[in-house]
Amino acid sequence: ARNGDHCPLGPGRCCRLHTVRASLEDLGWADWVLSPREVQVTMCIGACPSQFRAANMHAQIKTSLHRLKPDTVPAPCCVPASYNPMVLIQKTDTGVSLQTYDDLLAKDCHCI
Amino acid sequence: ARNGDHCPLGPGRCCRLHTVRASLEDLGWADWVLSPREVQVTMCIGACPSQFRAANMHAQIKTSLHRLKPDTVPAPCCVPASYNPMVLIQKTDTGVSLQTYDDLLAKDCHCI
């Protein structure tokens, strides 16, 4: 259950999709990827206050226990709920190849 | 790819499965769950240093960008990779029912 999408901390402060521009050097890919040379990395960033975009029952439990034992149990964390595919042109021993990665760029976020 | 399981921060400091004892009151379930009255909640807790139990390519990217932009990009987070089912005896309008929850207790952890 995707619980409340209203962020009590203020607009843009809670778990959501962000885009971060990164070069191949930034990603540590410069020696095996040829294209694209700049990646618009979509990732999940932001706080997960009580019941905000709770992914499942486990996230709800975590929220409850974090409230009780904040030093022991961390708050839920903002992570990808799904991914977008991305195609890379890679170097190979014989030349180049196109490879699709299905777990590289976040499409949607939730708290868990 | 489940990367290195060696924790560079010392034994037990990195992302792993922990068990937290919780009552129905702790969980906010006292008014709808009859049994069990105490739950051994298994959850994922711990740090996610570089490439430790990286769940996928996205986790690897996140590690790289966190190193470059620690104020913008958070480190990967320790979350369940899979769940164990749990059966609850619940109150219903007509009496009680057994309900299985598949997303309640963490079984295995990774960093994402």
Epitope: S35, T42, P85, I89 | -
Partner: antibody, heavy 119, light 112 residues
Framework: QVQLVQSGAEVKKPGASVKVSCKAS????EGWYIHWVRQAPGQGLE????????????NHAQKFQGRVTMTRDTSISTAYMELSRLRSDDTAVYYC????????????WGQGTMVTVSS | EIVLTQSPATLSLSPGERATLSCRSS???????????LDWYQQKPGQAPRLLIY???NRAHGIPARFSGSGSGTDFTLTISSLEPEDFAVYYC?????????FGQGTKVEIK
């Protein structure tokens, strides 16, 4: 199969706007960039810009600054290119094409949309 | 912006002959690992362009072996080892080394 299908030919008056659509099928729309290229009658190819369907971010040639808008609707795997304040020298065939990024070759092209600007 | 100059403007040859098309760049298109951000396209009347060669020397999917690309830095060549009747068309080189992406003015390969 993998293809890009564009909207039909348009005839516009100078000063008007035109919006060309490009529907992708047979591949994950958000995994590839959409580029726009035009070709005036009897002339060569001219790159206009790109749209990253994953993020909605765009980039275009300086020549089209303030006149071109590139958008997308991921729910129907369609990219759009709108050109405003049309002039007679905008008469051309407009193509969409896909590439793995901003700097990649265009491996699949739409069939082209003829836009005629005439008073 | 990078200017690409193709020569000759027109090439008159017979089927079975070898075609050599040139593309010269106003600046180097060489990136790391010895790859150049130069591609070749074929266009027939009333049709969209078709990718032949990408990253200076890699044949696109389904392109016959008689097409080959070579060169580095600022000077590039597309070679058609033995012209088939369907090869008579206009050929464009394109650079994606930097924005704006630019094309050469084209070389028309016509039947002698």
């Amino acid at each position: 199969q993998v293809q890009l299908v564009q909207s039909g030919a348009e005839v516009k008056k100078p000063g008007a706007s035109v919006k060309v659509s490009c529907k992708a099928s047979g591949y994950p729309f958000e995994g590839w960039y959409i580029h726009w290229v035009r070709q005036a009658p009897g002339q060569g190819l001219e790159w206009m810009g790109w749209n990253n369907p994953r993020t909605g971010l765009t980039n275009h040639a300086q020549k089209f600054q303030g006149r071109v808008t590139m958008t997308r609707d991921t729910s129907i795997s369609t990219a759009y290119m709108e050109l405003s304040r049309l002039r007679s020298d905008d008469t051309a065939v407009y193509y969409c094409a896909r590439g793995v990024g901003a700097d990649a070759a265009f491996d699949i092209w739409g069939q082209g949309t003829m836009v005629t600007v005439s008073s | 912006e990078i200017v690409l100059t193709q020569s000759p403007a027109t090439l008159s040859l017979s089927p079975g002959e070898r075609a050599t098309l040139s593309c010269r760049s106003s600046q180097s298109l060489l990136w790391k690992h010895g790859y150049n951000y130069l591609d070749w396209y074929q266009q027939k009347p009333g049709q969209a362009p078709r990718l032949l060669i990408y990253l200076d020397r890699n044949r696109a999917h389904g392109i016959p072996a008689r097409f080959s690309g070579s060169g580095s830095g600022t000077d590039f060549t597309l070679t058609i080892s033995s012209l088939e009747p369907e090869d008579f068309a206009v050929y464009y080189c394109m650079q994606s080394f930097e924005t704006p992406i630019t094309f050469g003015q084209g070389t028309k390969v016509e039947i002698k």
